[in-house]
């Protein structure tokens, strides 16, 4: 969702969204200078009136956090940036239509990997988003995407991997060799919207087998 550049003052006005945190970004063109300032407006799709984003008026940085203004993940939004440089006319560029549900990317999950003697347990922690429920609770990714599931891989060596997947938050890879290092990777997938996070990676070593010492 990037607009075509026709001016040397402003280009690449687009939303960058991750886990429903929606940041408007842009680049200054070759004609922009250090005194170029930018102002941001936004609106819901279907509405006429543009709203000025407080805190993003006549700014010099090339980003603006519109998470709160675009927080309804079932709606579509537009944003536009107006660039003004000394002695020149203002240049305005608008984003393509933006939907956080469609366009947001998913960050790697937060996972705790717990080594045991012959197994490794992986606990996936729910990912909070800025999206609020009607009663003001922050929603997790699991509460937004019905089809969200986790794919876990345990690299035993260069040639062998173990796989688990599901919608649960607790997993355990069993039958491992004690006192051995393993590489785990955990990815979030949402099939309907074809989203896949980068993996969370943990390197863990199973605990040594001390039972012989007591026999």
């Amino acid at each position: 969702h990037t607009t075509v550049d026709t001016s040397g003052l402003l280009q690449h006005v687009k939303f960058q969204s991750s886990n429903f945190e929606n940041i408007l970004t842009w680049d200054g063109g070759p004609a922009s200078t250090s005194d170029t300032v930018y102002s941001v407006e936004y609106k819901k799709y279907g509405e006429r009136k543009w709203l000025a984003k407080a805190g993003c008026q006549r700014i010099t940085q090339k980003f603006c956090n519109l998470t709160m203004e675009t927080r309804n993940h079932t709606e579509f939004y537009y944003a536009k940036v107006t660039a003004v440089s000394a002695g020149g006319p203002p240049v305005t560029k608008m984003t393509d239509r933006f939907s956080s549900l469609q366009h947001t990317t998913i960050k790697p999950p937060d996972v705790t990997c717990i080594p045991k003697v012959r197994s490794i347990q992986m606990l996936v922690h729910p990912t909070l988003t800025p999206v609020l429920s009607e009663d003001g609770h922050q929603l997790t990714l699991e509460e937004i995407f019905h089809d969200l599931f986790y794919r876990l891989e345990l690299h035993v060596n260069h040639t062998y991997q173990m796989h688990l997947e599901g919608k649960q938050r607790e997993y355990e890879f069993l039958g491992l060799t004690p006192d051995t290092e393993f590489l785990g990777s955990i990815t979030i997938l949402t099939p309907i919207l074809s989203k896949e996070s980068a993996p969370y990676v943990c390197r863990v070593k199973t605990l040594p087998d001390r039972t012989w010492a007591y026999s």
Partner: antibody, heavy 117, light 107 residues
């Protein structure tokens, strides 16, 4: 202990309406995915609708879109299915079910809905 | 929608027999498949999830395998209490869809 108890089924004429309820207990109702699943006489199982009780996000199977509405009353731990413009092919046992720890493992006993003139 | 094709639709088994039921998905569902058992007048009961993982409390004579589009439920030695209808369920994307069911009867 998880319990789901459906009610509200009955005999209704084609074009009529019915509201099913499912009283839930034994788990955190206000943060769960809740389902309505139906089974026509002598037939297989079909997922009808799902709602997340916290986000309010809903999905429907194509055959009931625009006619059925799933909703919840989180204060009363109750799931609803409002069924309008009922057709004879909606005749079935309607079950509510929930996903706990990632698994759809708990079901109610079902309530019979018969659409007939 | 993802179609689940289950076979056979019914089968007759003697007690102690090894029984195999297959389920084919119209597209890849990874390992997002569950198997349910349903007896007349009762709600379905979860047996297997994640294609091959046995639900707590389910006898070990039940096992599941497969991934992608092809899945199998095996009962290693049928007991009288296993006579029921079995359904596969894809839990990959909405609408979740069941196979048509396989009725296991006594020979």
């Amino acid at each position: 202990e998880v319990q789901l108890v459906e009610s509200g089924g009955g005999l209704v004429q084609p074009g009529g309406s019915l509201r099913l309820s499912c009283a839930a207990s034994g788990f955190t109702f206000s943060s769960s995915w809740m389902y309505w699943v139906r089974q026509a006489p002598g037939k297989g199982l079909e997922f009808v609708s799902v709602i997340n009780t916290r986000s309010g996000i809903t999905h429907y199977v194509e055959s009931v879109k625009g006619r059925f509405t799933i909703s919840t009353d989180n204060a009363k731990n109750t799931l609803f299915l409002q069924m309008n413009s009922l057709k004879s092919e909606d005749t079935a046992v309607y079950y509510c079910a929930t996903r706990i720890q990632g698994l759809i493992d708990y079901w109610g006993q079902g309530t019979q809905v018969t659409v007939s003139s | 929608d993802i179609q689940m094709t289950q076979s056979p639709s019914s089968l007759s088994a003697s007690l102690g027999d090894r029984v195999t039921i297959t389920c084919q998905a119209s597209q890849s569902i990874s390992s997002q498949l569950a198997w349910y058992q349903q007896k007349p007048g009762q709600a379905p009961k979860l047996l297997i999830y994640g294609a091959s993982r046995l639900q707590t409390g389910v006898p070990s004579r039940f096992s599941g395998s497969g991934s992608g589009t092809s899945f199998t439920l095996t009962i290693s030695g049928v007991e009288a209490e296993d006579l029921a209808t079995y359904y596969c369920l894809q839990d990959y994307s909405w609408p979740l869809t069941f196979g048509q069911g396989t009725k296991v009867e006594l020979k």
